[in-house]
Interface confidence: low
């Protein structure tokens, strides 16, 4: 069901954002720089 797929996808997106914020806060500029250089 497309709505279910979309909902699940967005839920994962929310979680990814939370993880990204956590990593940015904990690792700071080093994390951002590493991502940039990949």
């Amino acid at each position: 069901h497309s709505d279910g797929i979309f909902t699940d996808s967005y839920s994962r997106y929310r979680k990814q954002m939370a993880v990204k914020k956590y990593l940015a806060a904990v690792l700071g500029k080093r994390y951002k720089q590493r991502v940039k250089n990949k």
């Epitope: 979309f6 909902t7 967005y10 839920s11 929310r14 979680k15 954002m17 939370a18 990204k20 914020k21 940015a24 951002k32």
Partner: antibody, heavy 117, light 110 residues
Framework: QSVEESGGRLVTPGTPLTLTCTVS????????MCWVRQAPGKGLEWVGF?????SAYYASWAKGRFTFSKTSTTVDLKIASPTTEDTATYFC??????????????WGPGTLVTVSS | DIVLTQTPASVSAAVGGTVSISCQSS????????LSWFQQKPGQPPKLLIY???TLASGVPSRFEGSGSGTQFTLTISDVQCDDAATYYC??????????FGGGTEVVVK
């Protein structure tokens, strides 16, 4: 940390208009930014947001009428073809979320757009 | 379309009294708690009071309390002060990547 909108002015219907939100003290690579508008004497209306990865999401009524874009320190809202119904104060706000909450925690003072012939 | 119904539209309160504002959603907000409350005074931007349905924003007096989950939420202002005269809005954040404001409640302090 601050947010400030600019670019609001009197325009005639159909004249494209771009509003700019300038942020300082935090990074747009970490935070999402949201646009909210308020017609004179009316309630708040959510327009949409642009996320930290540059993807834009719009309210169902706003799709096709507004476009968001951003640089490292600014977020733009473009009204392609304004109508008199777009007359409002436009607010830019930092849209922060975690898995456990969502919040619009930092607002600009707003910029007034008047659409009139 | 999702509807977020705020009641009452206007309420009068005496200084020292208590005010309750209800916010009912036609669908559950994201995570059952992605609901915020804002205070707005004329000529000013909205000010965040409560987020996550019940978490007090920084610098907001503990007289403000948020409760509820899913589709039904309440903002309670205890020991009402003159400075609390304002319009209050709830904001729901939904799985469909849409945020909806309630219609607002004007609080008049006598």
């Amino acid at each position: 940390q601050s947010v400030e909108e600019s670019g609001g002015r009197l325009v005639t219907p159909g004249t494209p208009l771009t509003l700019t939100c300038t942020v300082s003290g935090f990074s747009l690579s970490t935070y999402n930014m949201c646009w909210v508008r308020q017609a004179p004497g009316k309630g708040l209306e959510w327009v949409g947001f642009i996320n930290s990865d540059d993807s834009a999401y719009y309210a169902s009524w706003a799709k096709g009428r507004f476009t968001f874009s951003k640089t490292s320190t600014t977020v733009d809202l473009k009204i392609a073809s304004p109508t008199t119904e777009d007359t409002a104060t436009y607010f830019c706000a930092r849209y922060d979320w975690d898995y456990y909450y969502s919040r619009l925690d930092l607002w600009g003072p707003g910029t007034l757009v008047t659409v009139s012939s | 379309d999702i509807v977020l119904t705020q009641t009452p539209a206007s309420v009068s309160a005496a200084v020292g009294g208590t005010v309750s504002i209800s916010c009912q959603s036609s669908e559950s907000v994201y995570n059952n708690n992605y609901l915020s409350w804002f205070q707005q005074k004329p000529g000013q931007p909205p000010k965040l009071l409560i987020y996550g349905a019940s978490t007090l924003a920084s610098g907001v007096p503990s007289r403000f309390e948020g409760s509820g989950s899913g589709t039904q939420f309440t903002l309670t202002i205890s020991d009402v002060q003159c400075d609390d005269a304002a319009t209050y809005y709830c904001l729901g954040d939904y799985i469909i990547i849409e945020n909806i404001f309630g219609g607002g409640t004007e609080v008049v302090v006598k």
